[in-house]
């Protein structure tokens, strides 16, 4: 069957070093516990998670990304998920997409990181 | 003139505590996230800990975590690093460094720090 | 961590050379990179921010490129003053890393 994919609207903000959550799901919403389900970051399509056969895929990440994933699944039998990035950094800021891929049908969300600096009163440079 | 002077350094036994001050003058001093950075005799430079414009904010490398604390006075214009359970591998002149770049472009002079018995 | 690996560990050059110096980080930081020079006895000096950012003071001898994993410092007239040990450091992810220092003698 067919569906949309829904990320957040509007940018996200997280502080560098910090964890940031950047949601992603289905609509209308159903079990997506056997689709592929990932994240890559344009326009070089890096890895930054992916969910296949029910289980993380560490192998194909980007090396940048390596140890700092999580996927959250608590809610993935109703099409939600969300993905966890640790200990930001600068390069994390700008655009990541986030698929979920039912047999030979796919779709996609694209949605937007900014990392801020949370040392400097007025972030500098 | 801007300025950062490192003061507190000195010889220490192993296991015993020791407090160090950076005191800085010549910009705004509460508006920088400040840093420690130390460099073992004859070594590289290796990055120990930083602390926000406003002292909410504290990252500190694995190798002193649960061992020193950074913190910072905005009134008095000073930055300081407590050092306890001191090892022999903390032995090293300690610099205070800030930036209006992300980089280092603020550097103290340095304190030497040595830990023997 | 972010390992930064530079190289050569020393450099022999004369007065007037052409000199290269290279770090390379273990994992992607874009163009937030920056070098310091640091003579015998002194603080480092910040040379170069954002992988080519000259520092207000530098001179224009000194310059840096690259960007992701791979950062070059270039000194392109050797001036007796120059003659010290470089260090690269990233400033994209806590914690900052450096790398293991250029030292850069007379030949």
């Known amino acids: 069957g067919q569906f949309r994919v829904i990320g957040p609207r509007h940018p996200i903000r997280a502080l560098v070093g910090d964890e940031v959550e950047l949601p992603c799901r289905i609509s209308p919403g159903k079990n997506a516990t056997g689709m592929e389900v990932g994240w890559y970051r344009p326009p070089f399509s890096r890895v930054v998670h992916l969910y296949r056969n029910g289980k993380d895929q560490d192998g194909d990440q980007a090396p940048e990304y390596r140890g700092r994933t999580e996927l959250l699944k608590d809610a993935i039998g109703e099409g939600k998920v969300t993905l966890r990035i640790r200990n930001v950094r600068f390069s994390d800021e700008g655009g990541f997409t986030c698929f979920f891929r039912d047999h030979s049908y796919q779709e996609e969300a694209a949605m937007e990181l900014k990392v801020e600096d949370p040392f400097y009163w007025v972030s500098p440079g | 003139q801007v300025q950062l002077q490192e003061s507190g350094g000195g010889v220490v036994q192993p296991g015993r505590s020791l407090r160090l001050s950076c005191a800085a003058s010549?910009?705004?001093?509460?508006?920088?996230?400040m840093h420690w950075v130390r460099q073992a005799p004859g070594k590289g430079l290796e990055w120990v800990a930083v602390i926000s414009y406003d002292g909410s904010k504290k990252y500190y490398a694995d190798s002193v975590k649960g061992r020193f604390t950074i913190s910072r006075d905005n009134a008095k214009n000073t930055l300081y690093l407590q050092m306890n359970s001191l090892r022999a591998e903390d032995t090293a002149v300690y610099y205070c460094?800030?930036?209006?770049?992300?980089?280092?472009?603020?550097w103290g002079q340095g304190t030497m720090v040595t830990v023997s018995s | 961590d972010i390992q930064m690996t530079q190289s050569p560990s020393t450099l022999t050059a004369s007065v007037g050379d052409r000199v290269t110096v290279t770090c390379r980080a273990s994992q992607t930081i874009n163009r937030w990179l920056a070098w310091y020079q640091q003579k015998p006895g002194k603080a480092p000096k910040l040379l170069i921010y954002?992988?080519?950012s000259l520092d207000s003071g530098v001179p224009s001898r000194f310059s840096g490129s690259g960007s992701g994993t791979e950062f070059t410092l270039t000194i392109s007239s050797l001036q007796p003053d120059d003659f010290a040990t470089y260090y690269c450091?990233?400033?994209?992810?806590?914690?900052?890393?450096f790398g293991r220092g250029t030292k850069v003698e007379i030949k």
């Open positions: 450091q990233q400033y994209n992810a806590y914690p900052r890393t």
């Open positions: 460094a800030t930036g209006n770049s992300h980089a280092f472009d603020i």
């Open positions: 010549g910009f705004t001093f509460s508006s920088y996230g």
């Open positions: 954002l992988a080519s």
